[in-house]
Interface confidence: medium
């Protein structure tokens, strides 16, 4: 089941999946002068079977004006694309993403994509939230959205995630350095994500399943 | 059900200090943020700031900078806000309110505690 | 600090009439804009949020519109447990409200 909305936009925040649900749709976008070739897919599909899941189809751009010259897909790991409505700033990085049963990775750039990616995400897609540059959160550890299907309609739930302006004094001025976690946890630059349905403030969790490591930096 | 019980009602001199305490039940105290909310006799409401429950943090309104300190006791599950140097015009009703819910964003009030009378006067 | 205006301040209407409340935010705050509801000697009450969800429990009869610097509250058929002081509120910067509209009995 597709779900119906793009995921919360959280001021001066970004948003970033680290795996892809099976079903999930990755639309074949150009970038300005090129189009898709005309044979190829619009779009491409996480699908696999119980033990491996991977994007069926490939997509492939062509210059506008050369009518026959198709661009193989080649990967170029510099560009690293971001879905639509995102401005990520390269704050997420993957540590060590392990592959997760019955998701996808993110697809590898191809030639002359577009600058942002459209996804179309699936009941039960979970994406990360973070802080753009020049704002930090009121909180340390990661913020996330899941796509829920409740009473028949699909929602996501609501990251409990604020970013402070560090410059700008309308954005929540005067913040205070964070104290040391409650629960005693030690916070410490790379929070350990657990895949859970609790969106609310994220405090720094001891993962039992080590499915990934998120890379956040705090000022 | 979520529940916040503030304090009872005070009355300061001007140049004094107020601490109102608000406490949380029937949720995780530290898995939302708290927001403190003033509004003055016959007056619109006005915000002040937010705390952080799990780590602490804090952010304020301009207007209060420097005044207002909002701090947490975890094992209680309070939050307070405490107001200094006050003036006449900080005579007000002074509310904690939780932010967000499930499917609501942080910065908005889907929870208030009844409300704090403070008076200040000579 | 982005500033809310709410008009009218009061609006006189009967049991079963049509409020429309209207907020001007001074610059956009796209659809990040919420509606609280207060009675006398009570704590305000969510009723919409981001511009047109209401809030857990909130009748259908309560509705909102509008994005970027205009919003508007409507209340299809008052009630006569609906007349009260509304405000409403954006959220993408330092929180503000409006300064309220009164809906009084006629």
């Known amino acids: 089941e597709l779900c119906d909305d793009d995921p919360p936009k959280i001021t001066h925040a970004t948003f970033k999946a680290v795996a892809y649900k099976e079903g999930t749709m990755l639309n074949c976008e150009c970038k300005r002068g090129f189009r898709r070739i005309k044979s190829g897919s619009p779009y491409m599909l996480c699908t696999g079977n119980s033990s491996h899941s991977s994007w069926d189809n490939q997509c492939q751009c062509t210059s506008s004006a050369a009518r026959n010259t198709t661009k193989q897909v080649t990967p170029q790991p510099e560009e690293q694309k971001e879905r639509k409505t995102t401005e990520m700033q390269s704050q997420m990085q993957l540590a060590d993403q392990v592959s997760l049963p019955g998701h996808c990775r993110e697809p590898p750039p191809w030639e002359n994509e577009a600058t942002e990616r459209i996804y179309h995400f699936v009941v039960g897609q979970t994406v990360y939230y973070q802080c753009v540059q020049g704002y930090r959160a009121l909180h340390r550890g990661p913020a996330e959205s899941v796509c829920k299907m409740t009473h028949g309609k699909t929602r996501w739930t609501q990251p409990q995630l604020i970013c402070t302006g560090e410059t700008e004094p309308s954005q929540f001025p005067g913040e205070e350095e964070p104290q040391a976690s409650p629960d005693g946890l030690p916070e410490s630059e790379t929070s350990r994500l657990v895949t859970t349905t609790d969106f609310r403030i994220q405090t720094e969790v001891a993962a039992t399943m080590e499915t990934f490591i998120f890379t956040t930096e705090y000022q | 059900q979520v529940q916040l019980v503030q304090s009872g009602a005070e009355v300061k001199k001007p140049g004094a200090s107020v601490k109102v305490s608000c406490k949380a039940s029937?949720?995780?105290?530290?898995?939302?943020?708290m927001h403190w909310v003033r509004q003055a006799p016959g007056q619109g409401l006005e915000w002040m700031g937010i705390i952080n429950p799990s780590g602490g943090s804090t952010s304020y309104a301009q207007k209060f900078q420097g005044r207002v300190t909002m701090t947490r006791d975890t094992s209680t599950s309070t939050v307070y806000m405490e107001l200094s140097s006050l003036r006449s015009e900080d005579t007000a009703v002074y509310y904690c309110a939780r932010g967000g819910a499930e499917y609501i964003p942080a910065e908005y009030f889907q929870h208030w505690g009844q409300g704090t009378l403070v008076t200040v006067s000579s | 600090e982005i500033v809310m205006t709410q008009s009218p301040a009061t609006l006189s209407l009967s049991p079963g009439e049509r409020a429309t409340l209207s907020c001007r935010a001074s610059?956009?705050?796209?659809?990040?804009l919420a509606w609280y509801q207060q009675k006398p000697g009570q704590a305000p009450r969510l009723l919409i949020y981001d511009a047109s969800n209401r809030a857990t429990g909130i009748p259908a009869r309560f509705s909102g519109s509008g994005s970027g610097t205009d919003f508007t509250l409507t209340i299809s058929s008052l009630e006569p447990e609906d007349f009260a002081v509304y405000y409403c509120?954006?959220?993408?910067?330092?929180?503000?409200f409006g300064g309220g509209t009164k809906v009084e009995i006629k």
């Open positions: 610059q956009s705050v796209s659809s990040y």
């Open positions: 509120q954006q959220r993408p910067f330092l929180p503000t």
């Open positions: 029937g949720y995780t105290f530290t898995s939302y943020y």
